[in-house]
Interface confidence: medium
C-alpha cells in the first residue's frame, strides 16, 4: 500500500484535498472534469421534513416523559433510561425550527446558538446510542445472570446516567470547538465546522474517537448483550420475558435502521480520507450523496420512539389512559384492568421495564 | 455551484499592456490557489502565475518581469497585469483557482474543488 504524510494530505482543508473541476476548457483533456456534488433537494422540502419531525417529536416525547414521570411507583431501570432517551430527542427536536430557519434565510443566529444548536445535535446521538447500549447491558444482567443489583441501587442508575451526558459532550466537544458562523461573501452565512489549519493528527482523532467510541464500541456491546439475552430466552422458553423485551428490541433495531447506514457512510469517508481505501471523483461525489441521503433518517429517528411504545408498548398506553383517567379526560371505565404504570412489560420480579 | 467569471482579454498591439481580472461566486468558505493558465492554438496548456492565500507568488519564466498576479481576498478576484507583451503572448487565458465550497443538504460540509473559467482570449498583433 502506497505510503502518504499526513500532513501533505491535510495541509489546505479538514475534509479533502481531492481536486475537483468544473467549467472545464474542452481543449484542456490533461485534467479530469469532476464537480463536487451533494443530493438537490428544494429547501421548502426541507424545511417541511424539519417542521413534521419536530411536532412528532415535541408532542410524542413529551407523552413518554409525562407517562414515565407519573408512575413513579412501577418505574424500571429500562424506564430511567427511556426517560433520558426521550430527554434526548426532545431536546434535538428544540433545534429543528432553528436549522429550518436556517435553511431558508442562512444562519442569521450568530456562533453561539450555531455551537449550541450543533452540540445537542451530537449529544442527543451519543447519548441515545450510550442509553441503548446500558439498556442492553441492564436487560442482559437482569435475564441471562438474574442480577438485582442496579434494582436496587437507584443511586447507581443516575450515576450511570450523569456519566451518559458527560461522556455524550465529551464526544460531541469538537463540535463545540470547531463550529462557527463563516460569512461567506456570496451566499449566506452558514453555521459550519471550520478547523482552519489544525494538524493531521487532531483531524483524525476528532473524526475515529467519537466514531469508534460513539458508534461501534456500543454497537458491539449492544450486539453481545442482546445476543446472549435472546439465547436465554429462546432456551428457557420464556414467553412471557421474550413478550417483555419485545419494545427493546423494536427500539434498538430503530436506531440502528435510522443511524448505522449514515454511520457506515461516514466510516467509508474516513476510509477514504486516511487512503485506506482509493479515492475517486465518483466515489467522492457517492459518498457527499450518500451523506445527505441516510443523514435524514438519522433526524427521522427522533420522532420514532414514542411511535415504538404506542403501537407496541402496551404499558405504555396502559400508562398514557391512566394520566387522562386521572385528569378527567376519558371514563375510568375505559382503564384497562391491569394497568401498571410501567410501560414495557416485566421481564423479572425485580427488574421490570417499561415501553 | 460556482462560477469563475473572467474579463480583460481583446486585441493589443506589441509591447502594450492588459489587465484580465477573476471574480470566483458560488459557495465558497475560503480561496486556497488563485492562478492564470493559457494555452496557445495547437500548443499544450500551461501555467503562466499562480498566488496562494498566503500571498506565495510562482510565475512561469516567460513572463518574469514582464506579468504581475495579485489577488483580492475580500472580493474573491485574481488579477493579472501583462505589460510589455508580445506576439507569442497570444492565446486563450484561463483562470483557476483551488476553492474550498460546501455541499450538503443537512449538514454543510466542506469540498476542495479546482475550478476553471471559460477562458479569455489575448492577442498580441500589429
Known amino acids: 500500500m502506497q505510503s502518504f504524510n499526513f500532513e501533505d494530505f491535510w495541509e489546505n482543508e479538514d475534509f479533502s484535498n481531492y481536486s475537483y473541476s468544473s467549467d472545464l476548457p474542452p481543449s484542456l483533456p490533461d485534467v479530469a472534469p469532476c464537480r463536487p456534488e451533494s443530493l438537490e433537494i428544494n429547501k421548502y422540502f426541507v424545511v417541511i421534513i424539519y417542521a413534521l419531525v419536530f411536532l412528532l417529536s415535541l408532542l410524542g416525547n413529551s407523552l413518554v416523559m409525562l407517562v414515565i414521570l407519573h408512575s413513579r411507583v412501577g418505574r424500571s431501570i429500562t424506564d430511567v433510561y427511556l426517560l433520558n432517551l426521550a430527554m434526548a430527542d426532545l431536546l434535538f427536536a428544540l433545534t429543528l425550527p432553528i436549522w429550518a430557519a436556517a435553511k431558508v434565510n442562512g444562519w442569521i443566529f450568530g456562533t453561539f446558538l450555531c455551537k449550541v444548536v450543533s452540540l445537542l445535535k451530537e449529544v442527543n446521538f451519543y447519548s441515545g446510542i450510550l442509553l441503548l447500549a446500558c439498556i442492553s447491558v441492564d436487560r442482559y444482567l437482569a435475564i441471562v445472570h438474574a442480577t438485582r443489583t442496579l434494582t436496587q441501587k437507584r443511586y447507581l442508575v443516575k450515576f450511570v446516567c450523569l456519566s451518559i451526558w458527560s461522556l455524550s459532550l465529551l464526544l460531541a466537544l469538537p463540535v463545540l470547538l470547531f463550529r462557527r458562523t463563516v460569512y461567506l461573501t456570496y451566499i449566506s452565512p452558514v453555521c459550519y465546522e471550520d478547523m482552519g489549519n489544525n494538524t493531521a493528527k487532531w483531524r483524525m482523532v476528532l473524526r475515529i474517537l467519537p466514531q469508534t467510541f460513539g458508534f461501534i464500541l456500543p454497537l458491539l456491546i449492544m450486539l453481545f448483550c442482546y445476543g446472549f439475552t435472546l439465547r436465554t430466552l429462546f432456551k428457557a422458553h420464556m414467553g412471557q420475558k421474550h413478550r417483555a423485551m419485545r419494545v427493546i428490541f423494536a427500539v434498538v433495531l430503530i436506531f440502528l435502521l435510522c443511524w448505522l447506514p449514515y454511520h457506515l457512510v461516514l466510516l467509508a469517508d474516513t476510509l477514504m480520507r486516511t487512503r485506506l481505501i482509493n479515492e475517486t471523483c465518483q466515489r467522492r461525489n457517492n459518498i457527499d450523496q450518500a451523506l445527505d441521503a441516510t443523514e435524514i433518517l438519522g433526524i427521522l429517528h427522533s420522532c420514532l420512539n414514542p411511535l415504538i411504545y404506542a403501537f407496541i408498548g402496551q404499558k405504555f398506553r396502559h400508562g398514557l389512559l391512566k394520566i387522562l383517567a386521572t385528569h378527567g379526560l376519558i371514563s375510568k371505565d375505559s382503564l384497562p384492568k391491569d394497568s401498571r404504570p410501567s410501560f414495557v412489560g416485566s421481564s423479572s420480579g425485580h427488574t421490570s421495564t417499561t415501553l | 455551484e460556482v462560477q469563475l467569471l473572467e474579463s480583460g482579454g481583446g486585441l493589443v498591439q506589441p509591447g502594450g499592456s492588459l489587465r484580465l481580472s477573476c471574480a470566483a461566486s458560488g459557495s465558497i468558505v475560503r480561496i486556497n490557489t488563485m492562478g492564470w493558465y493559457r494555452q496557445a492554438p495547437g500548443k499544450q496548456r500551461e501555467l503562466v502565475a499562480d498566488?496562494?492565500?498566503?500571498?506565495?507568488?510562482n510565475y512561469a519564466d516567460s513572463v518574469k518581469g514582464r506579468f504581475t498576479i495579485s489577488r483580492d481576498n475580500s472580493k474573491n478576484t485574481v488579477y493579472l497585469q501583462m505589460n510589455s507583451l508580445r506576439p507569442e503572448d497570444t492565446a486563450v487565458y484561463y483562470c483557476?483557482?483551488?476553492?474550498?465550497?460546501?455541499?450538503?443538504?443537512?449538514?454543510?460540509?466542506?469540498?476542495?474543488?479546482?475550478?476553471w473559467g471559460q477562458g479569455t482570449l489575448v492577442t498580441v498583433s500589429s
Open positions: 498566488i496562494t492565500s498566503g500571498g506565495n507568488i
Open positions: 483557476n483557482a483551488e476553492i474550498v465550497v460546501l455541499v450538503g443538504v443537512w449538514t454543510q460540509r466542506a469540498r476542495t474543488g479546482n475550478y
